[in-house]
């Protein structure tokens, strides 16, 4: 099919465009080149005749178009007016005619733009701005850029008039950038020139440096004030309301205690007609003062507060020494020193960060220290604990139990007997105690600062008789060469003595064997197989003596390394194989079976009814203990003979 | 306002010759193609032949090819159709008609009113 | 040359009608080269419509045209008194250009 291609689409006014004709026919009388999108003879180009090769201009020739024998068509130096369509009429050798359309744009070579602004010297928080791209040029994109970046998306930028303006509303000091516009078209791409945004701003509220109030007397007093602004802001100085000097320094030699007083720092712009003041106390000592310590928090809460601690005063050119427990500060995570070390930060207090805390100022000669300092961490309370510790008492005699909670505030104490209030006291006594007296007895702390409290609950028995004794044990299975068993005969009774026997024997002596807690607790290290016994607790006082019930000790062991019988190896064709594997193990192990690496069954016994000698090779069982985690095995070669065919050979089973 | 009107109507004797001339106004006449079509009496449309507006190149039908002679006179806004050794079969309205295209098109945008050749003896 | 064959030769309708004229060409033609005539006895003929489809300027929007090929379509969506005339088709794809015999359309 004939087609027309353009080269190029888009063309730049003054420059040139091939109209590139693809497909044509062969056997052709000529062709006519026409303007638009049809035949139109008002509207022809040029017409070329094949046979004598005449081009003839038709009414819209303007002397810049070129026709080839291809029947493309070259226009030069291309003017606006050329965009559009055009139409190749194709007369062929039969006086067929044949015709295609193609067509392309024409743009100006774009002028390099500038920007236009409505508003040279915008204020802060109160002007907008309008940058305008120049020239408006037709078929054009408007593009901006900010400090070589694309626009950022702001709700105070706003694009208009087809991108040409860009307006930022209510400007601030951080619109202060350069500013580019682009202009491009699809044959050329031009930026502007910088512009720079001058934002008129401020006085902000000036800063007095440097921010130390103390001086000495003697020194020189430099104060310089600074106040963000744009054009850069007037400064004045007034010491106690009296106007002292237009500068943004202030310098004072040698000054004495009568320099002491307000200063301040007033700044003014003189484009946005704002004044800003700033005031700061200055103190002059006629010698260096003693340093004391202040605190943010005088009563931290452990694990809770941060306690920030100041040495004052503040002093220009002055060295801050801190010292805990008179000692110097140590290497801590929880401790911070500011950059002028004048500000100690204890982050998330504990009870241990009492102190006490000193600090120092050094002058030339010496160190002024502070006087200390003591913090009152709240803390607590902690569970209390109830002492004595028994549980038995026999009756008549007196039962005095005494409660304490670590606390700051020191804890207020309260007694319950069987969850009935008994008295608000630390301490509580009974005289010539009797069965009645026997029950749950509670304490229970109170922190009034931090509204926390905190009990511990003890039973209590009053009897003549002994109770009966009862072992307990810290690890009821414990593993072969590994674990240590801890028994303890309960309960703890007042005036006992407390025996023990091992499968109905006194204890034997053993390294492994100790006795601890008034012979209360008997631990095993190292358990072994062994130690699987019955082990029995006693207790006796003068009057009574009782036994416990006998707790075995159930130790996990093995797998061992399993045996497989029979012990034949030799067997002769048509036997039964029944081989069974063992292994002494606690609890028992799983038994599997493999035959030549093949995994078989999950049993104890393999059994293979009349062997042959496709079944010589190796039987290997593997033993595993899930409780103790440990694995076995052993291997065993079997043959099969043929029948017959060597003597001494089991039958099987 | 495209106008084309046609003269040189008249009755001729078989074998001899007239001259149709079609003078045209309100385009650029030189600019385009021109043809002639004609009509036999109770028949259809039936073209004739064509020239072109800026290069001399002519189209005939194969019922007039070598009889009838087409030309025109750019200078002059006319359009001539010689036609020798005439036929009884040529007898019809003759009608002039403009081409859109400036090579011969084949497509008629404008046309006149017709004139009418007798050939009869 | 390519054969045009119109039909029917004669339409009677009445005006408000729908009136639709057929042409078929002996081979295929491209739609860009097929033109449709209106010709009225003692006047001259009238371009309506080109490229198969494409109104000639001044004509009415109840005339249009269709088809593709070898077959293409003249409608008259709803007939006027000055539609009844004879309507041709024509190509002027290759030479000679041919018209068809004519659609005769008269008022019933």
């Known amino acids: 099919k004939l087609t027309i291609e353009s080269t190029p689409f888009n063309v730049a006014e003054g420059k040139e465009v091939l109209l590139l004709v693809h497909n044509l026919p062969q056997h052709l009388f000529g062709y006519s080149w026409y303007k638009g999108e049809r035949v139109d003879g008002n509207r022809q180009i040029i017409g070329y005749v094949i046979g004598t090769q005449q081009a003839t201009p038709g009414p819209a020739y303007s002397g810049r178009e070129i026709i080839y024998p291809n029947a493309s068509l070259l226009i030069q130096n291309i003017i606006q007016n050329d965009t559009g369509f055009y139409t190749l009429h194709v007369i062929k050798s039969d006086l067929v005619n044949e015709e295609a359309t193609g067509q392309f744009r024409v743009y100006p070579e774009l002028p390099k733009p500038s920007i236009s602004s409505n508003n040279s010297k915008p204020v802060e928080d109160k002007d907008a701005v309008a940058f305008t791209c120049e020239p408006e040029t037709q078929d054009a994109t408007y593009l901006w850029w900010v400090n070589n970046q694309s626009l950022p998306v702001s709700p105070r930028l706003q694009l208009s008039n087809g991108n040409r303006t860009l307006t930022l509303f209510n400007v601030t000091r951080n619109d202060t950038a350069s500013y580019k516009c682009e202009t491009q078209n699809p044959v050329s791409a031009r930026r502007s020139d910088s512009v720079i945004l001058n934002v008129l701003y401020g006085p902000d509220a000036p800063t007095i440096s440097p921010l130390n109030t103390s001086y000495r007397s003697g020194e020189n007093l430099n104060l310089s004030c600074h106040a963000a602004s744009n054009p850069p802001a007037q400064y004045s100085w007034f010491v106690n309301g009296t106007f002292q000097q237009s500068t943004q320094e202030l310098f004072i030699p040698n000054i004495t205690v009568n320099n002491s007083g307000s200063y301040t720092c007033q700044a003014h712009n003189s484009d946005t007609g704002l004044n800003r003041t700033t005031v700061t106390t200055i103190t002059v000592y006629a010698e260096p003062p003693k340093p004391f310590i202040t605190s943010n928090n005088s009563n931290p809460v452990e694990d809770e507060d941060a306690v920030a601690l100041t040495c004052e005063p503040e002093i220009q050119n002055t060295t801050y020494l801190w010292w805990v427990n008179n000692q110097s500060l140590p290497v801590s995570p929880r401790l911070q020193l500011s950059n002028d070390n004048r500000t100690l930060t204890l982050l998330s207090v504990t009870r241990n960060d009492v102190g006490p805390y000193e600090c120092g100022i050094q002058n030339e000669l010496s160190v002024d220290h502070s006087d200390p300092v003591i913090l009152n961490v709240l803390y607590g309370p902690d569970d209390p604990t109830i002492s004595p510790s028994y549980t038995y008492y026999r009756p008549g005699v007196n039962l005095s139990l005494s409660c304490h909670a670590a606390s700051n505030p020191p804890a207020q104490y309260s007694w319950l007997i069987d969850g009935n209030i008994q008295q608000h006291t630390q301490e509580l006594f009974i005289s010539n105690i009797t069965e009645k007296n026997s029950g749950l007895y509670t304490c229970q702390a109170n922190n009034s600062a931090s509204g926390h409290s905190r009990t511990t609950v003890k039973t209590i028995t009053v009897s003549a008789e002994l109770p009966k004794p009862s072992i307990s044990s810290n690890n009821s299975k414990p593993v072969e060469d590994k674990d240590a068993v801890a028994f303890t005969c309960e309960p703890e009774a007042q005036n006992t003595t407390y025996l023990w026997w091992v499968n109905g024997q006194s204890l034997p002596v053993s390294p492994r064997l100790q006795l601890s807690n008034g012979n209360r607790t008997l631990t095993l290290f190292n358990v072994t197989r062994n130690d699987a016994r019955a082990y029995v607790c006693g207790i006796q006082n003068s009057v009574s003596a009782n036994r416990s019930d006998p707790v075995t000790l159930d130790v996990l062991y093995g797998p061992d390394t399993p045996i497989i019988s029979p012990p034949d190896s030799s067997y002769l064709s048509g036997a039964n194989l029944n081989l069974s594997c063992h292994s002494a193990s606690n609890p028992s192990p799983q038994y599997s079976w493999r035959i030549n690496g093949i995994p078989q069954q999950h049993t104890q016994v393999l059994f293979i009814a009349k062997i042959t000698p496709n079944n010589n090779g190796t039987y290997a069982c593997f033993v595993s203990n899930l409780a103790t985690g440990r694995n076995n095995s052993i291997v065993k070669s079997i043959t099969v003979s043929a029948s017959g065919t060597s003597p001494g050979l089991s039958a099987g089973a | 306002e495209v106008q084309l009107v046609e003269s040189g109507a008249g009755l001729v004797q078989p074998g001899g010759s007239l001259r149709l001339s079609c003078a045209a106004s309100g385009f650029t006449f030189s600019s385009y193609a021109m043809t002639w079509v004609r009509q036999a009496p109770g028949k259809g449309l039936e073209w004739v032949s064509a020239?072109?507006?800026?290069?001399?190149?002519?189209y005939y039908a194969d019922s007039v090819k070598g009889r009838f002679t087409i030309s025109r006179d750019n200078s002059k806004n006319t359009l001539y159709l010689q036609m020798n050794s005439l036929r009884a079969e040529d007898t019809a309205v003759y009608y002039c008609a403009k081409d859109r295209g400036n090579w011969n098109y084949g497509l008629f945008d404008y046309w006149g009113q017709g004139t009418l050749v007798t050939v009869s003896s | 040359e390519i054969v045009l064959t119109q039909s029917p030769g004669t339409l009677s309708l009445s005006p408000g009608e729908r009136a639709t004229l057929s042409c078929r060409a002996s081979?295929?033609?491209?739609?860009?080269?097929l033109a449709w005539y209106q010709h009225k006895p003692g006047q001259a003929p009238m371009l309506l419509i080109y490229g198969a489809s494409s109104r000639a300027t001044g004509i009415p929007d109840r005339f249009s045209g269709s088809g593709s090929g070898t077959d293409f379509t003249l409608t008259i969506s709803r007939l006027e008194p000055e539609d009844f005339a004879v309507y041709y088709c024509?190509?002027?794809?290759?030479?000679?250009?041919?018209f068809g015999q004519g659609t005769k359309l008269e008022i019933k």
């Open positions: 024509q190509q002027f794809g290759s030479s000679p250009w041919t």
């Open positions: 081979q295929s033609i491209s739609s860009i080269y």
């Open positions: 020239i072109s507006g800026s290069v001399d190149i002519t």
